[in-house]
């Protein structure tokens, strides 16, 4: 009988005596086998000990010379921890960052909503100056055009799922020269006809620009 084999153990064939070196019917385990953790369940004024391979949620395994035991996580807003001062899972609504729990991620870090962790975000440089106002690669011949500014990605995010902020943006601008030097003026009727064409061209250019920005962001 394997219970009799260990002379040091005072086992009762009871499931709560699993892993015990010393056990009683009323109080369960009072000492555990070497690699197990002692946990004391308290119910009102009564208690019984258990020997566990891993500690319950809210506790961590504390190794001690006399006996390993489960000890309570005392890190603010922490649900489970690895040690006295390193959290592994925060309470709902808090983000995990370097073993601590925060209500928002520190600067330069982005929240991963599926794991509620703060990971290194996408780092971008400063905006460039606004570019020249142009349309159809021309800087004259139209009343309105678009000017663009850009910024570089300094550091790629730790995970591909973290989006980078916009790295290029455009805005409507008034051309410096509506008429190109040496160009012929069009009659009023022709001007009206071309107005519709021009509006459509701007719309299409803006659409293409949006598509370009979106694909550019995906490629990053």
């Amino acid at each position: 009988n394997r219970w009799r084999r260990n002379k040091r153990a005072s086992y009762v064939s009871n499931p709560i005596c699993k892993g015990c070196l010393s056990c009683s019917k009323d109080n369960g385990c009072s000492r555990c086998q070497q690699k197990l953790f002692f946990f004391l369940r308290r119910e009102g004024m009564r208690q019984y000990g258990e020997c566990l391979h891993s500690c319950p949620s809210g506790y961590y395994g504390h190794r001690a010379p006399d006996m390993n035991r489960c000890a309570r996580c005392r890190i603010e807003n922490c649900d489970s921890c690895f040690s006295k001062d390193f959290c592994t899972k925060c309470k709902v609504g808090f983000y995990l960052h370097r073993g601590r729990c925060f209500d928002e991620c520190p600067d330069g870090f982005a929240p991963l909503d599926e794991t509620m962790e703060c990971v290194e975000g996408c780092e971008v440089g400063h905006w460039s100056e606004w570019g020249t106002c142009s349309r159809n690669n021309r800087t004259c011949g139209f009343k309105w055009g678009l000017e663009t500014r850009t910024r570089q990605i300094v550091k790629k995010p730790a995970k591909d799922t973290i989006p980078c902020p916009t790295i290029a943006e455009s805005r409507r601008c008034k051309m410096a020269m509506r008429h190109c030097p040496g160009g012929k003026r069009t009659p009023k009727a022709k001007e009206k006809r071309n107005k519709k064409k021009r509006r459509k061209l701007i719309e299409r250019a803006q659409e293409q620009h949006s598509v370009f920005l979106a694909t550019d962001r995906v490629n990053q």
């Epitope: 946990f39 506790y59 001690a64 006996m67 035991r69 309570r72």
Partner: antibody
Framework: EVKLVESGGGLVKPGGSLKFSCAAS????????MSWVRQTPEKRLEWVAS???????YYPDSVKGRFTISRDNVRNILYLQMSSLRSEDTAMYFC???????????????????WGQGTSVTVSS | DIVMTQSHKFMSTSVGDRVSITCKAS??????VAWYQQKPGQSPKLLIY???TRHTGVPDRFTNSGSGTDYTLTISSVQAEDLALYYC?????????FGGGTKLEIK
């Protein structure tokens, strides 16, 4: 710095009542269990009462039904109401942080990690 | 109730000596033992909990050993300021109980 200051002790006649308090500062009072421990004139320490952070109360049989522990988490004050006092209740009463019989912590809060300076109670006719 | 017995009411020692204060529980208390020091005119102070863990700020000359029912508080090199009453307490099951105390006297 954890600070516990008791007040309200004094001389009471047998059968009489007394309520004293312990003002806590320097820690998150509402998060901790609190206890009362007394020291007899012979210097023996005896556990008197405990209250969990959630308000559950625990007493030894010697004071059950006569003593009531309570707490005010807004004002950070622990109380002990004593009635039907006996001569054997004569002691120095200390308030202490920790010692919750209802919760296992596996750390310092299972013991009583900080104590006040104590308040003296004498029950005599 | 669990009875905690400190067999020596008084212990006399000299500065620099190693001293051991013993405590015996009436049943196995699973290392759930705390030690307190009470200096003259002061309130008790926690030294050790869970049999071997020193409380914040406690000098490392204070150690505890033991398991089951027998526990020993050892001061490796006694200092003049260690003159005090020492109590053991079990925090295993209610009612919490204390030993009768051991008064450490410096020769």
């Amino acid at each position: 710095e954890v600070k516990l200051v008791e007040s309200g002790g004094g001389l009471v006649k047998p059968g009489g009542s007394l309520k004293f308090s312990c003002a806590a500062s320097g820690f998150s009072f509402s998060s901790y269990a609190m206890s009362w421990v007394r020291q007899t004139p012979e210097k023996r320490l005896e556990w008197v009462a405990s209250i969990s952070s959630g308000g559950s109360t625990y007493y030894p049989d010697s004071v059950k039904g006569r003593f009531t522990i309570s707490r005010d988490n807004v004002r950070n004050i622990l109380y002990l109401q004593m009635s039907s006092l006996r001569s054997e209740d004569t002691a120095m009463y200390f308030c202490a942080r920790g010692g919750d019989p209802g919760v296992y912590n596996g750390d310092y809060e299972d013991a009583m990690d900080y104590w006040g300076q104590g308040t003296s109670v004498t029950v005599s006719s | 109730d669990i009875v905690m017995t400190q067999s020596h009411k008084f212990m006399s020692t000299s500065v620099g000596d190693r001293v051991s204060i013993t405590c015996k529980a009436s049943q196995d208390v699973s290392s759930a033992v705390a030690w307190y020091q009470q200096k003259p005119g002061q309130s008790p102070k926690l030294l050790i909990y869970w049999a071997s863990t020193r409380h914040t700020g406690v000098p490392d000359r204070f150690t505890n050993s033991g398991s089951g029912t027998d526990y020993t508080l050892t001061i490796s090199s006694v200092q003049a300021e260690d003159l005090a009453l020492y109590y053991c307490q079990q925090h295993y099951s209610t009612p919490w109980t204390f030993g009768g105390g051991t008064k450490l006297e410096i020769k």
